[in-house]
Every structure is written in structure tokens, then in C-alpha cells.
């Protein structure tokens, strides 16, 4: 078996792997350096992709910030008149300052009133929401916080105890339901796990996934 594999390595195109029925086959297959199952994406490529994604995200954030600035500018330009100071004397400029101060005071008062109304509305909404929950006999909605969580932990949190017995997400994702192959290799188990274990990938994989 090993000979066949090494022959294939000397040819320009690698031959397909032999049908694997015994665990010894897998061991030999795994220990052959030329036939070692490589990760589809190298670590440097992963890093490159991560960096690219971060760059794109950064650009998006900058674009959004720029859009917000532009929106603010547009809003201000519709609300604030340009200062037309040309030809105005010192007297008019002083008067204008008084006018603008008065306008600022007025806007401040309006802002204070609006904030008070908003606060009142928020309180009313909270009270009404609470009443709705009370009427439905439901618990009070907790305040949500943003948390870092893995997919497994999320499933655990969502499904509780059932998650352990019913759902191993990654196992589900990796399972290939081909009846013939399953019958043939029933005694073998998951050959990928064997390869990972033998090549020392298991530990690294766990680290990466966590």
C-alpha cells in the first residue's frame, strides 16, 4: 500500500487513494508525508484573509463615519444660515452676536424641553411594556448586553441541557450521509479524527475553534 502511494508521488498526477478498510491503512496513509491531508487554507493565507476582512471593515466604518459627517453637514446647512459679515460694521456685529446668543438660548430651551419629553416618553413606554408583560403573565424583559460567544456556547444557552445530548454542531456539519460508505467503513469510525490525532492537529484545532 505504501509502495503504491510512493509510486503515485513519482508520477505527474497523483493516483486516487486506495479503498481504505482497515485502521492500519489509515495509520500508514496518515504517516506518509506526501499523502498527508493538508488544511485547505494555510495559516498565512488565513491571516491575510483576516487582515483583508479587517481592512474592509475599517473602510466600511470610515465610510459610515464620513456619511454621518456629511449628513450632519447637510442638516446643519439647512438649519444654520451662512454668516454674512461683509460690510457689517462693529455695531451690527455686536448686535448679531446678541441675536445669535439669544437664538442659542432659545434652541437650548427647546432642546431641554424636547429631552424632557423624550425622557417622559421613554418612561411611559417602559411602564406600558411592563404592563403588557404583566397582563400576559410574562417575565420582565432583561436588558441585553453584547457578549462574545462561540457557536457551541450559543446553542448550549439556547437549548440548555438538550444541547449536549442532541446537538454537536460541528459533528453534524462534518457528517456525510452516504449509506454505502457508512456500511463499508462502519468499524473504522471517523478517519479524519484519527488523522488529526496522529498528526497532532487535535490540540491545535481545539485552540483555533475556541
Amino acid at each position: 500500500m505504501a509502495d503504491g502511494s510512493s509510486d503515485a508521488a513519482r508520477e505527474p498526477r497523483p493516483a486516487p487513494a486506495p479503498i481504505r478498510r482497515r485502521s492500519s491503512n489509515y495509520r500508514a496513509y496518515a504517516t506518509e508525508p506526501h499523502a498527508k491531508k493538508k488544511s485547505k487554507i494555510s495559516a498565512s493565507r488565513k491571516l491575510q484573509l483576516k487582515t483583508l476582512l479587517l481592512q474592509i471593515a475599517k473602510q466600511e466604518l470610515e465610510r459610515e463615519a464620513e456619511e454621518r459627517r456629511g449628513e450632519k453637514g447637510r442638516a446643519l446647512s439647512t438649519r444654520c444660515q451662512p454668516l454674512e459679515l461683509a460690510g457689517l460694521g462693529f455695531a451690527e456685529l455686536q448686535d448679531l452676536c446678541r441675536q445669535l446668543h439669544a437664538r442659542v438660548d432659545k434652541v437650548d430651551e427647546e432642546r431641554y424641553d424636547i429631552e424632557a419629553k423624550v425622557t417622559k416618553n421613554i418612561t411611559e413606554i417602559a411602564d406600558l411594556t411592563q404592563k403588557i408583560f404583566d397582563l400576559r403573565g410574562k417575565f420582565k424583559r432583561p436588558t441585553l448586553r453584547r457578549v462574545r460567544i462561540s457557536a457551541d456556547a450559543m446553542m448550549q444557552a439556547l437549548l440548555g441541557a438538550r444541547a449536549k445530548e442532541s446537538l454537536d454542531l460541528r459533528a453534524h456539519l462534518k457528517q456525510v450521509k452516504k449509506e454505502d460508505t457508512e456500511k463499508e467503513n462502519r468499524e473504522v469510525g471517523d478517519w479524519r479524527k484519527n488523522i488529526d490525532a496522529l498528526s497532532g492537529m487535535e490540540g491545535r484545532k481545539k485552540k483555533f475553534e475556541s
Epitope: 451662512p82 454674512e84 461683509a86 460694521g89 462693529f90
Partner: antibody
Framework: EVKLEESGGGLVKPGGTLKLSCAAS????????MSWVRQTPEKRLDWVAT????????FYPDSVKGRFTISRDNARNTLYLQMNSLRSEDTAMYYC?????????????WGQGTLVTVS | DIVMTQSPSSLAMSVGQKVTMSCKSS????????????LAWYQQKPGQSPKLLVY???TRESGVPDRFIGSGSGTDFTLTISSVQAEDLADYFC?????????FGAGTKLELK
């Protein structure tokens, strides 16, 4: 040559209305603040109103506030003074005046005036 | 409001004489930030509209003969005509441009003897 020409004056009854115009030429009208100044029969000069170059800022003395409205049409190079609720003390020669350059002061140019008689 | 008081109300002078007229304001017209006094002098000849002679109390407007000299600071100002000419026969008004409402003095009438 800077030229300011007032029109629209005349005889009006107390409580009446009148609209004065001032046609400007010889300078970039939209770059200067403009004012109306009146001169009573006793030769006393009274400032009536001022408007900024773009028309956003307006200034009046208390004596005319709420009764007179200054405005401008920069496309037509024209300054206006709408006078409502006229009183006998509003009788005067009404001049339109251009303010000096920003780094200077005072009314640099005056029109020939238009006479308003409230009687 | 700033009150502007001019004196004398009229004066008669002969050609070639030196003329001095006064203008007092009820409060200072000096802007401490730029050290400028916001006072202007106007000349109004009979049947004509006013003409700017001096601004910032002492700066002569372009085209105004150098015999017209503005001076003073704060609340006391003076317009001097060093050598009166026949064409100087007119009313002279001072005006403060320091604060609104803008106010004028009652004027000084210059007559020739």
C-alpha cells in the same frame, strides 16, 4: 461708478402703507450690507434699518421695529423698505446707503433720497 | 442708546480760516480690541445727500481733501477744517457706528461770512 436710486415715496395717510425701492448699480450688490437712513424736515438723520449682504441678518431701531421691513433681491440688485402703520413722525426724506468695505466703517455711498409724507 | 451731541449748532467763518467743530458721545466709542473709535463724519451740502468724510474718527475717506482732519478718542471728537473754502458750506454730522441703534448728532451748520 456706484449709483443708488430710491423710488416709491409719496403722500400717505396715517396708518397707511408704502413700499420704497432702491436700485443699485456700479458695484457687486450681493457683497455689501445695505441700510435705510431718513432725514426729518428738521434735518435730523435717523437710522431706519440694516440688512446683511445675503439678507439673513436684519437690524432695526425700536422706533420702527414691527412696522417696517427691510429686504433685498440680489438678483435684481434692489433694496426694499416696506412701511406699514405709518405715523406723522415717519415723514422724512428716505435714503438708501451702502456700507463701507468690511475693514472700514460708516455709510460710504448714499442715494439721492425719496420723500415720504405722512399727513 | 448712545446719544451724540454736536456743538456749535452753527458757525460763520471766512474763507481761509480754521474751523473746529465738536462731537461728544454719551459712552466710549473705542473698541479696545483693535484700538479703533467707531465714529464717522459726514458732509451734506444744500440739496444733496450726505457724503462720508472721515471714519474711525481720523481716517480720511478717499477723495476727501486733506484740509479735513478728524481727531479724538473715547467720547470726545473733533472735525477740523484747516483752511475753509467756499465749497465747504454745508451741514456736518457725526455718527457712531459702535452699537445699535446707530445714532447721529444733530449737526453743525457751517456758513460763510
Amino acid at each position: 461708478e456706484v449709483k443708488l436710486e430710491e423710488s416709491g415715496g409719496g403722500l400717505v395717510k396715517p396708518g397707511g402703507t408704502l413700499k420704497l425701492s432702491c436700485a443699485a448699480s456700479g458695484f457687486t450688490f450681493s457683497s455689501y450690507a445695505m441700510s435705510w437712513v431718513r432725514q426729518t424736515p428738521e434735518k435730523r438723520l435717523d437710522w431706519v434699518a440694516t440688512i446683511s449682504s445675503g439678507g439673513s441678518y436684519i437690524f432695526y431701531p425700536d422706533s420702527v421695529k414691527g412696522r417696517f421691513t427691510i429686504s433685498r433681491d440680489n438678483a435684481r440688485n434692489t433694496l426694499y423698505l416696506q412701511m406699514n402703520s405709518l405715523r406723522s413722525e415717519d415723514t422724512a426724506m428716505y435714503y438708501c446707503a451702502r456700507h463701507h468695505n468690511p475693514d472700514k466703517s460708516g455709510f460710504a455711498y448714499w442715494g439721492q433720497g425719496t420723500l415720504v409724507t405722512v399727513s | 442708546d448712545i446719544v451724540m451731541t454736536q456743538s456749535p449748532s452753527s458757525l460763520a467763518m471766512s474763507v481761509g480760516q480754521k474751523v473746529t467743530m465738536s462731537c461728544k458721545s454719551s459712552q466710549s466709542l473705542l473698541n479696545s480690541s483693535n484700538q479703533k473709535n467707531y465714529l464717522a463724519w459726514y458732509q451734506q451740502k444744500p440739496g444733496q445727500s450726505p457724503k462720508l468724510l472721515v471714519y474711525f474718527a481720523s481716517t480720511r475717506e478717499s477723495g476727501v481733501p486733506d484740509r479735513f482732519i478728524g481727531s479724538g478718542s473715547g467720547t470726545d471728537f473733533t472735525l477740523t477744517i484747516s483752511s475753509v473754502q467756499a465749497e465747504d458750506l454745508a451741514d456736518y454730522f457725526c455718527q457712531q457706528h459702535y452699537s445699535t441703534p446707530l445714532t447721529f448728532g444733530a449737526g453743525t451748520k457751517l456758513e460763510l461770512k
